[in-house]
């Protein structure tokens, strides 16, 4: 559904979007898995958390993530189509005081301990471009999404609308 300029054009206003209110509109715990049903797991190693993408054994418990959903307002003069728009942004916290962060320089996804208000690097624009799957776009770097690379989470540049549905940026949320 994109014109020739693709993802860069439709995301150009993300930098300027403001999150309305400081409290989330809803929060809930869910396990995160890839399009191919691999689980996203979090392990404490040497006093820091590592993030893995792996197949779980049959009865192994899935790690849960607290997803906090925020509403973000786009004034019409920034949205490019003459209407005020709203987006959903999420933060993801697998354990108390730790949040997923986008490290745009390293193209990596990291867990950082931080206090509220959270930095922009902890916010991701929520997309559901595919039936019952979601994608997470960096608020700080439009067109860059959380994805799976070599059994780890990484930041992946999506440079055309066709690539918005590549399986490596699609995730499933499950409350079970």
């Amino acid at each position: 559904a994109f014109g020739i300029s693709g993802v860069q054009k439709y995301t150009r206003a993300l930098h300027d979007s403001s999150i309305t209110g400081i409290s989330p509109i809803t929060e809930y715990l869910a396990s995160l898995s890839t399009y191919n049903d691999q689980s996203i797991t979090f392990a404490l190693e040497d006093e820091s958390y590592e993030i893995y993408v792996e197949d779980l054994k049959k009865d192994e418990k899935k790690d849960k993530v607290l997803l906090s959903y925020y509403e973000s307002q786009h004034p019409s003069n920034e949205s490019g189509d003459g209407v005020d728009g709203k987006m959903l942004m999420v933060t993801l916290s697998p354990t108390k005081d730790f949040w997923l962060h986008a490290n745009n320089k390293e193209h990596s996804v990291e867990l950082h301990k931080c206090e509220k208000p959270l930095p922009d690097q902890a916010f991701f624009v929520l997309h559901n471009m595919h039936s019952n799957c979601v994608s997470f776009e960096c608020k700080t770097d439009p067109g860059v999404f959380i994805g799976v690379k070599d059994n780890h989470l990484a930041l992946i540049k999506v440079d055309s609308s066709e690539n918005l549905c590549t399986e490596n940026i699609l995730f499933k949320l499950s409350e079970t």
């Epitope: 559904a1 994109f2 809930y28 949205s79 709203k86 959903l88 929520l126 609308s161 918005l164």
Partner: antibody
Framework: QVQLQESGPGLVKPSETLSLTCTVS????????VHWIRQPPGKGLEWIGV???????SYNSALMSRVTISEDISKSQVSLKLSSVTAADTAVYYC???????????????WGQGTLVTVSS | DIQMTQSPSSVSASVGDRVTITCLAS??????LAWYQQKPGKSPKLLIY???RLADGVPSRFSGSGSGTDFTLTISSLQPEDFATYYC?????????FGQGTKVEIK
Amino acid sequence: QVQLQESGPGLVKPSETLSLTCTVSGFSLSKYGVHWIRQPPGKGLEWIGVLRAGGTISYNSALMSRVTISEDISKSQVSLKLSSVTAADTAVYYCARDHYYYSSFGGFASWGQGTLVTVSS
Amino acid sequence: DIQMTQSPSSVSASVGDRVTITCLASQTIGAWLAWYQQKPGKSPKLLIYAATRLADGVPSRFSGSGSGTDFTLTISSLQPEDFATYYCQQLNSTPYTFGQGTKVEIK
């Protein structure tokens, strides 16, 4: 301002294909999903499918074998085709726009006025 | 598919009454529920989204509550223009199913 307008023939013969167009203005199809919903006379609402902002399409599995949704970006149009129609497909057909950019979680904020399609010979 | 069950199917009420409509999802849908108002011959109008959020231009006498599987739409003081049919809809997963509707009629 945001507008959606359904158009197409009001009468379709059984076994033929129903074709409707939703022409949108005031927003970009690259940011918002557009849904098709129908409502048989005196009955409730049924979701048919969606053309998402990324260009992907999801259908109601109950209709999937008969339904096709497509778009013409240059004309800001989203089309619905429903094949092999019967009297049970007689309904008011609506197109509607997502409340949120890029996702459908916030429901449908703007609706067309609807167009009645009667299936009869 | 997720089934949405609304109750009651109809309610008779007077202007000024408090009206409550409930919606039950067959499985958990988080907060991804919307409420619509529809008047005869008109398109549905979004009232509430994300279970509790008031859509733009909707009077504050409308409110939504609930999460998971149980949801409620409340009209705190019914006005003449509120007589209509109300639908809930889940947006957690496709197909995005609607409740069967609740008709609010004049007593």
